[in-house]
């Protein structure tokens, strides 16, 4: 903590500008008015302050706002955001998507830090649910964001938000997460026609039950093997050879390459050899 010292004559800062980079830490503490800093936060980013100087500026804001910064200040924190601790951020009330975007921009290109995770958590809890605009923003900055949420947290995603989800946003989701997301996606895309529906629902199918896979098999969807391999084993096992053949269409010959991988292996073992032989792939049940 910086010791309290009087500001030398003529050094009082009338505004936040480049001249402050030549101030020692104690001079910044003594000569920069915290209220002035708060109103001119947008200027701080344009000035090449050292990390030590930024520490002083943060300290001044902390003193001015012991209960947490107002959103007008938070929105213009810029690189000063990197100095904040999760404890600092828990005091904030961030409601504007623009504020969220501004702070995520500061951390862009980096892994999600504890600060960012706390910020997002505060923002989403404040909104009460993961609406489409928020999800759009978060997945744009962090494609893996959705899959970092627990199934419980995902349950607060409204079906309307599913339209913002891109296939790559689901890359790291596990089956438990897809179990929660799939019914929402099914609801969101229910009014689409067959082929368009399959394109949209494909990434969520790791959460699909057997009856939905049976229904898809009647729609000439030609599911690829990568998608088939991501299906729940318990959902695949009851499918007949004829249903799998219809589901995969021309991709059915790909079963041969994956005959020892789950869920293909487990499915093969459940089938009658006579039925498997109709595929002409040499699969051994």
């Amino acid at each position: 903590e910086v010791e309290k010292t009087a500001c030398p004559s003529g050094k009082k800062a009338p505004e936040i500008d480049e001249s402050l980079i030549f101030y020692k830490k104690w001079e910044l503490e003594a000569c920069v008015d915290a209220a002035l800093l708060a109103t001119q936060m947008d200027r701080v980013n344009a000035i090449p302050f050292t990390y030590e100087q930024l520490d002083v500026l943060k300290h001044k804001l902390d003193e001015l706002y012991p209960q947490g910064y107002p959103e007008s200040v938070i929105q213009h924190l810029g690189y000063l955001f990197l100095k904040m601790s999760p404890e600092d951020i828990r005091k904030w009330n961030v409601t504007s998507l623009e504020t969220l975007k501004a702070l995520l921009e500061v951390n862009k290109g980096h892994e999600m830090s504890p600060q960012v995770a706390t910020l997002i958590d505060r923002f989403v809890k404040g909104r009460g649910q993961l609406d489409k605009d928020t999800l759009d923003t978060l997945t744009a900055f962090y494609p893996g964001y959705l899959c970092s949420l627990s199934p419980e947290e995902l349950s607060s995603v409204p079906p309307s938000s599913i339209w913002a989800v891109r296939p790559q946003d689901l890359d790291t989701c596990d089956p438990r997460q897809l179990d929660v997301l799939y019914p929402k996606a099914r609801l969101a895309f229910q009014n689409m026609n067959g082929s368009e529906y399959f394109v949209k629902i494909q990434s969520f199918l790791g959460g699909a039950p057997t009856e939905d896979l049976k229904a898809l098999s009647q729609q000439n969807v030609s599911m690829d093997l990568a998608t088939f391999m991501k299906l729940r084993t318990d959902a695949v096992l009851p499918l007949t050879v004829a249903e799998v053949q219809k589901l995969l269409g021309p991709h059915v010959e790909g079963l041969k390459a994956e005959e020892r991988h789950r869920p293909v292996r487990d499915w093969i073992l459940r089938q009658r050899q006579d039925d498997l032989d109709t595929l002409g792939l040499g699969l051994q049940g």
């Epitope: 296939p167 790559q168 890359d171 790291t172 690829d224 093997l225 990568a226 391999m229 991501k230 991709h251 010959e253 790909g254 079963l255 041969k256 390459a257 994956e258 020892r260 991988h261 789950r262 040499g282």
Partner: antibody, heavy 119, light 108 residues
């Protein structure tokens, strides 16, 4: 551009283990299988096994079963091959290779990692 | 395991010459499950031909592949200097997947 980047050469002692990373870029790692292939000096290629990155399910050539372990970190898009109980016979170049799920051919190969087992 | 035998092990060809490399399987392989790879010294292998006769992306049209059952071949209609490399056949019809011993093709 699709790339599989492997680490540099490894010199290891007999009996030790080696873990080789294969960093995938330019595509979604969970949409393809990742296979591993051994090439001893001046010799042919030998299939070690493969892993489906989405669920981590791996299968092995019986010759390497119990000594090789194939894993994937989906978050960093990196596949790994660990080989234990190394002997001079394991001195070779090891390649990771992408395989389109549902096919058996390798359309993209890693840069290769040379492993030398010597005391 | 299914054994693939390539012949000849080493061969050289003059520019413009027609070249045929063969791959013989110890038991029948469906044509879908047979591919060829090219490898130059110090480099990784490259997919060259898949499903017996399909050329991989960027492979010159002078290359072709054919065969069925236990007998497969890769043909270069007119040898060029850049074709000098080792060629390996590969099957994924049965586990473990196996490769042939390779043919080293040199330019005269």
């Amino acid at each position: 551009e699709v790339q599989l980047q492997q680490s540099g050469p490894e010199l290891v002692k007999p009996g030790a283990s080696v873990k080789i990373p294969c960093k995938a870029s330019g595509y979604t790692i969970t949409d393809y299988n990742m296979d591993w292939v051994k090439q001893s000096r001046g010799k042919s290629l030998e299939w070690i096994g493969d892993v489906f990155p989405y669920n981590g399910d791996s299968i092995y050539n019986q010759k390497f079963e119990g000594r090789a372990t194939l894993t994937v970190d989906k978050y960093s898009s990196t596949a790994y091959m660990e080989l234990r109980g190394l002997t001079s016979e394991d001195t070779a170049v090891y390649f990771c290779a992408r395989r389109k799920t549902g096919t058996g051919y390798f359309d993209v190969w890693g840069t290769g990692t040379t492993v030398t087992v010597s005391s | 395991q299914l054994v693939l035998t390539q012949s000849p092990a080493i061969m050289s060809a003059s520019p413009g010459e027609k070249v045929t490399l063969t791959c013989s399987a110890s038991s029948s392989v469906s044509s879908t499950y047979l591919s060829w790879y090219l490898q130059k010294p110090g480099s990784s292998p490259k997919l060259w031909i898949y499903s017996t006769s399909n050329l991989a992306s960027g492979v010159p049209a002078r290359f072709s592949g054919s065969g069925s059952g236990t007998s497969y071949s890769l043909t270069i209609s007119s040898m060029e200097a850049e074709d000098a490399a080792s060629y390996f056949c590969h099957q994924w019809s049965s586990y473990p997947y196996t490769f042939g011993g390779g043919t080293k093709l040199e330019i005269k």
